[in-house]
Interface confidence: low
């Protein structure tokens, strides 16, 4: 049967969802085992003009020493104010100095990046050493690049659409996810449902999605269910500031007992089906309904506190 629940965007103060993901619009990861220089290329699009960006490079040490130097090629389409963290990494940075400003002196070797189109930038970078990773990101707020992590099967990095960068790169989009809500018609009471639907990614390896849930309610005020639906290879690590009913696909565990895995359920994989699930669990209100690309960390901040949500 059709569930009558007209999902509408909720007021921005009712709920906000931010997330970190390895999914990129275009990208590649390759192995360059014997290279002395590890080359990474980032094409960053900022559709909204001047932006701030936090870029962290993290080294995974092999045999206690950092094995090679790193060249990071940064190609941006508009002004960016960069907060770079690359502690102890022998980094060479190639960028357009008229577009990139550093929050503090970078303390690394820098090279002016020629004004080339993307394909030529890749060629220019490849001349300096085999490219380990390349990615195109749209409006990132923060990026974590893990060095020495490349586990690609490719020996040559060629940008391909809709890629999963695995552990090599994680990023957080500037724009929070769209949060919608609705009233489930004909259900009494004040129980609220928070529904998070993680869409299948471009790589089907086992994944743990950490879900941080912060609800601004006094503990006694809340009767809630958290419904987490994702592809079969996704398990969940839940970090919540309230006790609530948990209803998930796959397996889940709590951050306070990470080793204790609890088996989930087979849940519908359509919005309508998930609304039906919320109704079956006696929720009278869907306080937040969010669909996201495959993410590694999802943070939900909500303040609906049991049956008081109103949508437009």
């Amino acid at each position: 049967e059709t569930v009558h629940c007209d999902l509408q965007p909720v007021g921005p103060e009712r709920g906000e969802v931010t997330y970190t993901t390895s999914q990129v619009s275009k990208g590649c990861v390759a192995q360059a085992p014997n290279a002395i220089l590890e080359v990474h290329v980032l094409f960053l699009e900022f559709p909204t003009g001047p932006s701030q960006l936090e870029l962290t490079l993290q080294a995974s040490k092999q045999n206690g020493t950092w094995p090679r130097e790193v060249l990071l090629v940064l190609s941006v389409n508009s002004s960016v104010f960069l907060h770079l963290q690359a502690l102890g990494i022998p980094l060479h940075l190639a960028y357009n100095s008229s577009l990139v400003t550093f929050q503090e002196p970078p303390g690394v070797n820098t090279t002016e990046l020629p004004s080339f189109p993307k394909t030529q930038i890749l060629e220019w970078a490849a001349e300096r050493g085999p490219i380990t990773s390349a990615a195109e990101l749209n409006d990132p707020q923060s990026i974590l690049l893990r060095l020495g992590q490349a586990q690609g099967s490719l020996s040559f990095c060629m940008l391909e659409a809709s890629q999963d960068m695995g552990r090599t790169l994680e990023w957080r989009p500037r724009t929070p996810a769209l949060v919608r809500g609705c009233h489930l018609e004909g259900v009494a009471g004040h129980k609220e449902a928070h529904i998070l639907r993680v869409l299948p990614g471009h790589s089907a390896g086992p994944r743990t999605v950490t879900v941080k849930v912060e609800l601004s309610c006094a503990p006694g005020d809340l009767d809630a269910v958290l419904i987490l639906q994702g592809p079969p290879y996704v398990s969940w690590l839940i970090d919540a500031n309230h006790n609530m009913q948990i209803w998930t696909t796959g397996e889940y565990s709590f951050k306070i007992f990470p080793e204790k895995n609890i088996r989930g359920f087979k849940l519908p994989d359509t919005p309508q089906g998930l609304l039906g699930e919320a109704r079956m669990l006696n929720a009278s209100i869907v306080a937040s309904f969010v669909e996201l690309p495959l993410a590694s960390i999802v943070s939900l901040h909500a303040s609906s506190c049991g049956g008081r949500l109103q949508t437009s």
Partner: antibody, heavy 118, light 106 residues
Framework: EVQLVESGGGLVKPGGSLRLSCAAS????????MDWVRQAPGKGLEWVAE??????????YYAESVKGRFTISRDDSKNTLYLQMNSLKTEDTAVYYC?????????WGQGTLVTVSS | DIQLTQSPSSLSASVGDRATITCRAS?????MHWYQQKPGKAPKPWIY???NLASGVPSRFSGSGSGTDYTLTISSLQPEDFATYYC?????????FGGGTKVEIK
């Protein structure tokens, strides 16, 4: 410095139309959620309409009192917000403010007066 | 819709007095924002997210409250504080403003 400058107000007969514009500068316009808020003479503030950013699919929202008569739109390439007002009524007489929403209305234009009178 | 009722609607006070404006919501809201408006001028953001002072707002202003009841307090009124103050919520659609409180010189 953020600047919002409204224009297009004036005297119009009931049933008539008017198009307000708001020129924005000093911030990344395409990233902003933009609203129109009005204030009838001697009265309080009333939210009219909102258009969200490109990232939010330029979703639009309207107060019940103007739904079906007013249309909010934007041209990100020109950094301009618009309010097309049709089937105007005498109760639409007000100063119309263009505002930017960032957790609250953090920037306001100086306003443009719309008078609906026969 | 959530109605916001401000009280008093007008308040006469002297320089140096303490002034308190209340905004009551018809349903619980997450945050309340406040704006100051002077005659013939556009409103200015004054207090956001219930208790945070907007840029340039003097520390004699403070905001507090939760749920349905919120207050704006001026610890010691100064001549430039005489104006109209509006509360506003957007925890639920549609966004609504209070009717305003006019702070006048006694």
């Amino acid at each position: 410095e953020v600047q919002l400058v409204e224009s297009g107000g004036g005297l119009v007969k009931p049933g008539g139309s008017l198009r307000l514009s708001c020129a924005a500068s000093g911030f990344t316009f395409s990233d902003a959620w933009m609203d129109w808020v009005r204030q009838a003479p001697g009265k309080g503030l009333e939210w009219v309409a909102e258009i969200r950013s490109k990232a939010s699919n330029h979703a639009t929202y309207y107060a019940e009192s103007v739904k079906g008569r007013f249309t909010i739109s934007r041209d990100d390439s020109k950094n301009t917000l618009y309010l097309q007002m049709n089937s105007l009524k005498t109760e639409d007489t007000a100063v119309y403010y263009c505002t930017r929403w960032r957790r609250f209305f953090d920037s306001w234009g100086q306003g443009t007066l719309v008078t609906v009178s026969s | 819709d959530i109605q916001l009722t401000q009280s008093p609607s007008s308040l006469s006070a002297s320089v140096g007095d303490r002034a308190t404006i209340t905004c009551r919501a018809s349903s619980s809201v997450s945050y309340m924002h406040w704006y100051q408006q002077k005659p013939g001028k556009a409103p200015k953001p004054w207090i956001y997210a219930s208790s945070n002072l907007a840029s340039g707002v003097p520390s004699r202003f403070s905001g507090s409250g939760s749920g349905t009841d919120y207050t704006l307090t001026i610890s010691s009124l100064q001549p430039e504080d005489f104006a109209t103050y509006y509360c506003q919520q957007w925890s639920s659609n549609p966004l609504t403003f209070g009717g305003g409180t006019k702070v006048e010189i006694k």
